[in-house]
């Protein structure tokens, strides 16, 4: 069953390589367990960046070595991706699955274009 997922069209990463955006889903039912996956699309290749499953009322926890962190509030997930470099510029797609209770719902956003600009190295000072 399809579900609408909204996310911003464009986000500019900070000079420290951190990008944040909100992924909002229109829950058709009473979702109590949700899985959020961030996918990166570049050159027609799609790769999984990170994923987390969370129960409503519980914190959103990604794996320890994940480049993502996040918080949830109602039907919104605030996602932060860190450690980005210019080569990571691309379309970051938010995929939301309502895992429990049944029925299962899937929603995929249109993607957020994240632009990452590597900071200029500081000139040597004598």
């Amino acid at each position: 069953k399809a579900m609408h997922v909204a996310q911003p069209a464009v986000v500019l990463a900070s000079s420290r390589g951190i990008a944040s955006f909100v992924c909002e889903y229109a829950s058709p039912g009473k979702a109590t367990e949700v899985r959020v996956t961030v996918l990166r699309q570049a050159d027609s290749q799609v790769t999984e960046v990170c994923a987390a499953t969370y129960m409503m009322g519980n914190e959103l926890t990604f794996l320890d070595d994940s480049i993502c962190t996040g918080t949830s509030s109602g039907n919104q997930v605030n996602l932060t991706i860190q450690g980005l470099r210019a080569m990571d510029t691309g379309l970051y797609i938010c995929k939301v699955e309502l895992m429990y209770p049944p029925p299962y719902y899937l929603g995929i956003g249109n993607g957020t274009q994240i632009y990452v600009i590597d900071p200029e190295p500081c000139p040597d000072s004598d």
Epitope: M55, M99, Y100, Y104
Partner: antibody
Framework: QVQLVQSGAEVKKPGASVKVSCKAS????????INWVRQAPGQGLEWMGD????????NSNQKFEGRVTMTRDTSISTAYMELSRLRSDDTAVYYC?????????????WGQGTLVTVSS | DIVMTQSPLSLPVTPGEPASISCRSS???????????LYWYLQKPGQSPQLLIY???NLASGVPDRFSSSGSGTDFTLKISRVEAEDVGVYYC?????????FGGGTKLEIK
């Protein structure tokens, strides 16, 4: 090891209420949904509802017409199921069961059951 | 509600022989995500139910590999390759494609 320990047998009169408890141990209580299932004597299994221990959110079987209330106390890792306006056909063994997401929300651990007898 | 229908009601089996239990759902349990939301539980005499199979064909931890399950969207079969005395009890199929979760009426496996 994971354990769900339920309260003891109850005998109730028609029209009364019963509250069954389910104490969890051996895992983090707030990480798993708790379901309630009942079994009338010699009969099959009937799902009553579930509770999210984090925020207390519930889903219940409409068959119970609002007679079932599920709550929890996270401080003592215990879930409760209260059934009101009892009728003789509510006589059954009531089970709590833990859901496991790795098993696609199957009930992987069950309590020992609580026999509730409704009789005048 | 999705109705789960099991057959036979009772199944007498000789130890060492195979056994087969059928379950039919009133609606396809195969979701478009590729998952079949069908489960099997066993309730041994005087005990609480225990999980055998999840997602139609996956054995739960600790379940002997003499158990297997297969099926389509609506017709499912639980097979025991060689029945042992400890396998006696009532077998239930169940669905969690949608609420309310529903169970089959049960099949009682007994030793001849």
């Amino acid at each position: 090891q994971v354990q769900l320990v339920q309260s003891g047998a109850e005998v109730k009169k028609p029209g009364a209420s019963v509250k069954v408890s389910c104490k969890a141990s051996g895992y983090k209580f707030t990480d798993h949904f708790i379901n309630w299932v009942r079994q009338a004597p010699g009969q099959g299994l009937e799902w009553m509802g579930d509770i999210n221990p984090n925020n207390g959110g519930t889903n219940s079987n409409q068959k119970f017409e609002g007679r079932v209330t599920m709550t929890r106390d996270t401080s003592i890792s215990t879930a409760y199921m209260e059934l009101s306006r009892l009728r003789s056909d509510d006589t059954a063994v009531y089970y709590c069961a833990r859901l496991r997401r790795e098993y696609f929300y199957a009930m992987d651990y069950w309590g020992q059951g609580t026999l509730v007898t409704v009789s005048s | 509600d999705i109705v789960m229908t099991q057959s036979p009601l009772s199944l007498p089996v000789t130890p060492g022989e195979p056994a087969s239990i059928s379950c039919r759902s009133s609606k396809s349990l195969l979701h478009s995500n590729g998952i079949t939301y069908l489960y099997w539980y066993l309730q041994k005499p005087g005990q609480s139910p225990q999980l055998l199979i999840y997602q139609m064909s996956n054995l739960a931890s600790g379940v002997p590999d003499r158990f297997s399950s297969s099926g389509s969207g609506t017709d499912f079969t639980l097979k025991i390759s060689r029945v042992e005395a400890e396998d006696v009890g009532v077998y239930y199929c169940a669905q969690n494609l949608e609420l309310p979760l529903t169970f089959g009426g049960g099949t009682k496996l007994e030793i001849k």
